[in-house]
């Protein structure tokens, strides 16, 4: 994405599904700042690297970052 | 299916105010950025406005910008553009799109409203 | 701004016929452009996304390609509803969303 996080919220739209975790190249959880006043979830997308903005709030999207991190704590030692 | 219904539109005189709706369904609104377009009479694409999902950010295009202003009501499904001090180059069909990305890089305008027409004249 | 130039600003063609319209920007927008389709007295139509995703229910028949500066539209075979203005749109450097000033495809 060109502009970087300091400007504005990265995310203009949002979408409450979920996404399949073994799709996922990357997931960042940006927190509130002075320039978004709300918790960011971008879902990088291993297929051409598409971004995919999710709904924090989503039953759905609260449980995907339950299993990725578990999925995390499974392979830390 | 995906419906986006523009309503307000008229002839006004230069200097007045006008406020468009556009009623929105087939989606959930409340997760999506919307956009203003307008086209004057024989003429291309102008973009004059974005609103993110949440409201928090506005984004307007500098021939509009202070005279223009976008909002939503995210319980009415409905986004709003008031336009003030109108001039004669106002005059053009408004559209309302949805924004098919989530960045605003990504992605395009994927669904558009039928358009509605500002006349500005004395 | 970025200013987006589309060329040829009219274009005769035959159904049946390949159809290729060009979109330069006056600096690199990466590959955020989108081309749209639009019919007299109807709104646009999101043809292509990311210069080269098809939207949902575009013919295979069109095709984007290109990157940085310049973009091409494609229509491999010209069927008869397909005539009409095609604008492509910067998304790289917002605001403004910026549109090229369009290509007519008319009926030879």
């Known amino acids: 994405i060109p502009l970087s996080r300091t400007v504005r919220c990265t995310c203009i739209s949002i979408s409450n599904q979920p996404v399949n975790p073994r799709s996922l190249e990357k997931l960042e959880i940006i927190p509130p700042s002075q320039f978004c006043p709300h918790v960011e979830i971008i879902a990088t997308m291993k297929k051409k690297g598409e971004k995919r903005c999710l709904n924090p709030e989503s039953k759905a999207i609260k449980n995907l970052l339950k299993a990725v991190s578990k999925e995390r704590s499974k392979r830390s030692p | 299916q995906v419906q986006l219904v523009e309503s307000g539109g008229g002839v006004v005189q230069p200097g007045r105010s006008l406020r468009l709706s556009c009623a929105a369904s087939?989606?959930?609104?409340?997760?999506?950025?919307m956009h203003w377009v307008r086209q004057a009479p024989g003429k291309g694409l102008e973009w004059v406005a974005l609103?993110?999902?949440?409201?928090?950010?506005?984004y307007y295009a500098d021939s509009v910008k202070g005279r223009f202003t976008i909002s939503r009501d995210n319980s009415k499904n409905t986004l709003y553009l008031q336009m003030n001090s109108l001039r004669a180059e106002d005059t053009a069909v408004y559209y309302c799109?949805?924004?098919?990305?989530?960045?605003?890089?990504?992605?395009?305008?994927?669904?558009w409203g039928q358009g509605i027409l500002v006349t500005v004249s004395s | 701004e970025i200013v987006l130039t589309q060329s040829p600003a009219t274009l005769s063609l035959s159904p049946g016929e390949r159809a290729t319209l060009s979109c330069r920007a006056s600096?690199?927008?990466?590959?955020?452009l989108a081309w749209y389709q639009q019919k007299p007295g109807q709104a646009p139509r999101l043809l292509i996304y990311?210069?080269?995703n098809r939207a949902t229910g575009i013919p295979a028949r069109f095709s984007g390609s290109g990157s940085g500066t310049d973009f091409t539209l494609t229509i491999s075979s010209l069927e008869p509803e397909d005539f009409a203005v095609y604008y492509c749109?910067?998304?790289?450097?917002?605001?403004?969303?910026?549109f090229g000033q369009g290509t007519k495809l008319e009926i030879k």
């Open positions: 799109a949805r924004e098919g990305g989530y960045t605003g890089y990504d992605g395009g305008f994927d669904y």
């Open positions: 087939g989606f959930t609104f409340s997760n999506s950025a």
């Open positions: 609103i993110p999902f949440d409201g928090y950010n506005k």
């Open positions: 600096q690199s927008v990466s590959s955020y």
């Open positions: 990311d210069a080269s």
């Open positions: 749109q910067q998304r790289s450097n917002w605001p403004p969303y910026t």
